[in-house]
Interface confidence: medium
């Protein structure tokens, strides 16, 4: 399976909520021997990968944020610990995934990366990745409503498996 | 913030079998890889095995296969290593110590080691 | 099985040195190289991930470079509480295996 990022650039003015996507492509197994591991953090661009290193959001760490459920469920972070930080990861029975940040503010700006675990039972794993960027902007440049950027089809289908 | 506390030393007999235990608290315990590390004195970190307990199932290293059993308790949020045959050079202090993600990743958080020392 | 091997095994340094510890993997394991400090008594405390990401807490004098099969372990300016062992750790594949330790003395 690969991970799609519909979008690769959000802009946001202060004070606004954004829900940055991410989806999963091709097939995917839903037996009783595999758990899907979906998380998000923040990253740098790094010099050899994208998304290698795995920053907090909002102080919530990649842990903190994850969802972890057979190939069959929904599922949703803990509740009380996300919201208390204006955060909400899910992820639901169509291969969507997305975290949903609340009141955004200029620091909030930056890499946003989306990782999927396939973990299997005998020992195996594939992960794959997607990235985005949000902007924050404040004054009069700063768009009324979040705006939004298609992602290219190459940057749209960001795959890196272990 | 995860932590994972280890059972206390153990002094045993070559032949017979020893059973460390390490239970974590402060985060999700079932979805997380739990491996088992252990250091002979004055040596070097050596895997001995390890765990996801929502599956069940161990991986070893060659090495201890068949005198390692490595197990976890979901409901108490504990992982068990039982090592059999015991003999003098398996001497060492044995470390819990869990993935970041998946079966490979890096152990960010471990537990504080307990000696067993197998002396006649 | 994929072997690390670590070097020197043993050096010794001054407060204030830029020390540098490597570790070759006897294949490519892209960036699937960790670091480890280790001090007498204590378990191990991870200072790098994915060979070149600082964990979150650890001072930003430890660095880390590296991909394929030749990876480094920097500290730029050596402090008094880094006198210990060292350890790389390739998490490519199973069975996980470490280099064979670093030990940073004091000069």
């Known amino acids: 399976f690969k991970v799609a990022t519909p979008y690769s650039l959000y802009v946001c003015p202060e004070g606004q909520n954004v829900t940055l996507t991410c989806r999963l492509l091709g097939p995917v197994d839903k037996g009783h021997d595999v758990t899907f591991y979906k998380t998000w953090y923040r990253s740098s661009r790094g010099e050899v990968q994208t998304c290698s290193e795995r920053r907090p959001i909002r102080n919530l760490t990649f842990q903190d944020l994850h969802l972890h459920h057979g190939g069959h469920q929904a599922a949703n972070t803990s509740h009380d610990l996300a919201q208390r930080h204006g955060l909400e990861s899910a992820s639901d029975h169509h291969g969507n995934f997305s975290i949903t940040m609340r009141n955004l503010t200029l620091l909030d700006s930056g890499l946003y990366c989306c990782l999927v675990v396939e973990i299997r039972h005998h020992h195996s794993e594939h992960r794959v990745h997607g990235a985005m960027e949000l902007q924050v902007q404040t004054g009069k440049d700063a768009p009324s409503n979040c705006v939004v950027y298609p992602s290219s089809s190459q940057d749209s289908e960001n795959i890196t498996a272990a | 913030q995860v932590q994972l506390v280890q059972s206390g030393a153990e002094v045993k007999k070559p032949g017979s079998s020893v059973k460390v235990s390490c239970k974590a608290s402060g985060g999700t315990f079932s979805s997380y890889a739990i491996s088992w590390v252990r250091q002979a004195p004055g040596q070097g970190l050596e895997w001995m095995g390890g765990?996801?307990?929502?599956?069940?199932?161990?991986n070893y290293a060659q090495k201890f296969q068949g005198r390692v059993t490595i197990t976890a308790d979901e409901s108490t949020s504990t992982a068990y290593m039982e090592l059999s045959s015991l003999r003098s050079e398996d001497t060492a202090v044995y470390y819990c110590a869990r993935h970041s993600i998946g079966w490979v990743a890096e152990l960010d958080y471990w537990g504080q080691g307990t000696l067993v020392t197998v002396s006649s | 099985d994929i072997q690390m091997t670590q070097s020197p095994s043993s050096l010794s340094a001054s407060v204030g040195d830029r020390v540098t510890i490597t570790c070759r993997a006897s294949q490519s394991i892209a960036t699937d190289l960790n670091w480890y400090q280790q001090k007498p008594g204590k378990a191990p405390k991870l200072l790098i991930y994915?060979?070149?990401s600082l964990q979150s807490g650890v001072p930003s004098r430890f660095s880390g470079s590296g991909s394929g099969t030749d990876f480094t372990l920097t500290i730029s300016s050596l402090q008094p509480e880094d006198f210990a062992t060292y350890y790389c750790?390739?998490?490519?594949?199973?069975?996980?295996?470490f280099g064979q330790g670093t030990k940073v003395e004091i000069k």
């Open positions: 750790q390739q998490a490519h594949w199973y069975p996980l295996t």
């Open positions: 994915a060979a070149s």
């Open positions: 765990i996801i307990p929502i599956f069940g199932t161990a």
